[in-house]
Interface confidence: low
Amino acid sequence: SGVFQLQLQEFINERGVLASGRPCEPGCRTFFRVCLKHFQAVVSPGPCTFGTVSTPVLGTNSFAVRDDSSGGGRNPLQLPFNFTWPGTFSLIIEAWHAPGDDLRPEALPPDALISKIAIQGSLAVGQNWLLDEQTSTLTRLRYSYRVICSDNYYGDNCSRLCKKRNDHFGHYVCQPDGNLSCLPGWTGEYCQQPICLSGCHEQNGYCSKPAECLCRPGWQGRLCNECIPHNGCRHGTCSTPWQCTCDEGWGGLFCDQDLNYCTHHSPCKNGATCSNSGQRSYTCTCRPGYTGVDCELELSECDSNPCRNGGSCKDQEDGYHCLCPPGYYGLHCEHSTLSCADSPCFNGGSCRERNQGANYACECPPNFTGSNCEKKVDRCTSNPCANGGQCLNRGPSRMCRCRPGFTGTYCELHVSDCARNPCAHGGTCHDLENGLMCTCPAGFSGRRCEVRTSIDACASSPCFNRATCYTDLSTDTFVCNCPYGFVGSRCEFPVGLPPSFPW
């Protein structure tokens, strides 16, 4: 099922005459009859097998036809059909003159015909209008036409019936070819099968509407991929429904018997090691300094006499402390103190005893420092070099490596950047704090006046009489190309008329 649409656009009958050549009085009040029929190699009279339609009077002699309803008629004209579009057709368009208001064929004189056109060909279903223009000796008709499918009909021949729906029998819209296009969330031949929540377990879950995941017995979770253990399972899991597989450290039918008291209750104190020894039983192995079933009691750490070499032990909140006799040091008074006899001074330092030999002091040679003369003196630590100079240690002395533009022992003297005459082509050099600047003469540019800038000698429009000006870049001068009839370096002089020739 579909509609053949004909859009009349313009009719030209400049002389206002009928097909017979006789003029209309007072003008040709024109209406149209349209006949649509099956394809004929030669279009001949006979039944309009695909339909017929007439218009009201649309205008007089020559006129354009509006795209909307006009005088009760419609434009485009509609020729509906309720069969498969065959892809070919014949079309007859007759223009008639209406002397009065009665447009019925039997009410018109036979010579009221203004023009008649007949075309035939192939025409595919589609939205695009096909434009045509038919001209006779007296008239011209411009029109366009197309075939479109009726609502709910699709395909190349408008033969596929498809009506969109969203109910128990299907959830779809129709594609241009009439095939079903499922609404989001539906699938299947007639789009009746919902698409479950993404990831919903294929066997353990199902859905009755899109994006849903309903669990079958024994399964739970958003995607129905978690089994349900049997009722009362305390510390266990399942791999299939109604199981109770115990977690580590638990036992019994309901996994409620504690086999790992150490892990679940941490009974041992003060860093002791816990060992399981049966259901709800354990043993604590205490760290030194602690005792009791749970190692909760603290022993005095001085009981083990930790201080050596006659040191005396004092208990403290976080342990103990040894008070060492003279000549000993260390956590347990295990080390004896140094004296000059132990040669403690490095790099040629000399040792001096103090406090009757109980301790000593080192006197260091030049370039070394530290309590044992172990450190070399760095003469660059004071940053003596100015203006970003780099300090270098050179044996007992130091030197400064200066940045460009500076000199002197400590890079304190500024060298003039202009001393090298860096500006080309007579440019003037200016010393600046961070370098130099060149002021360039006319015709030159760049940081060092190294770029030759061409002067546009044509800028002042030196050529007369519409001559074309060219700049000579090598000499910065101009050349004028004179039009016919003028000479001179600026084309300023008119040439005299050429002499007349004797022939």
Epitope: G121, S122, L123, N128, W129, L130, L131
Partner: nanobody
């Protein structure tokens, strides 16, 4: 023949806008209508929108109605596609197309179709 060159594609975030342009050259006096098609990876080329060169109206596919607007400039032989409220599913190569009228033959009318090279539109989420 009509030559078509598209421009204006690019990368844009979802909800953003792009304006595609297509310039026609060659036998432009024969153009009947112009429009846009698109082709996403692994999918067939699909119609997006068209505009009648003589000013007789526009067409849009349902998924872009209210978001895309097609327009033309006959003097410049240009057609434009203003794309607003872009979605990730609008990601595709967009092709300009022109139908040229239309030759009458003994078997009916024949319509010619010309394609551009395409411009990539990518909408990120």
């Amino acid at each position: 023949e009509v030559q078509l060159v598209e421009s204006g594609g690019g990368l844009v975030q979802a909800g953003g806008s792009l304006r595609l342009s297509c310039v026609a050259s060659g036998d432009t006096s024969e153009i009947y209508d112009m429009g846009w098609f698109r082709q996403a990876p692994g999918k067939e080329r699909e119609f997006v929108s068209s505009i009648h060169w003589g000013g007789r109206g526009t067409n849009y596919t349902d998924s872009v109605k209210g978001r895309f607007t097609i327009s033309k400039d006959n003097a410049k032989n240009m057609v434009y596609l203003q794309m607003n409220s872009l979605k990730p599913e609008d990601t595709a190569v967009y092709y300009c197309a022109a139908t040229r009228l239309i030759v009458y033959t003994p078997t009916g009318f024949r319509q010619y179709f010309d394609w551009g090279q395409g411009t990539q539109v990518t909408v990120s989420s």
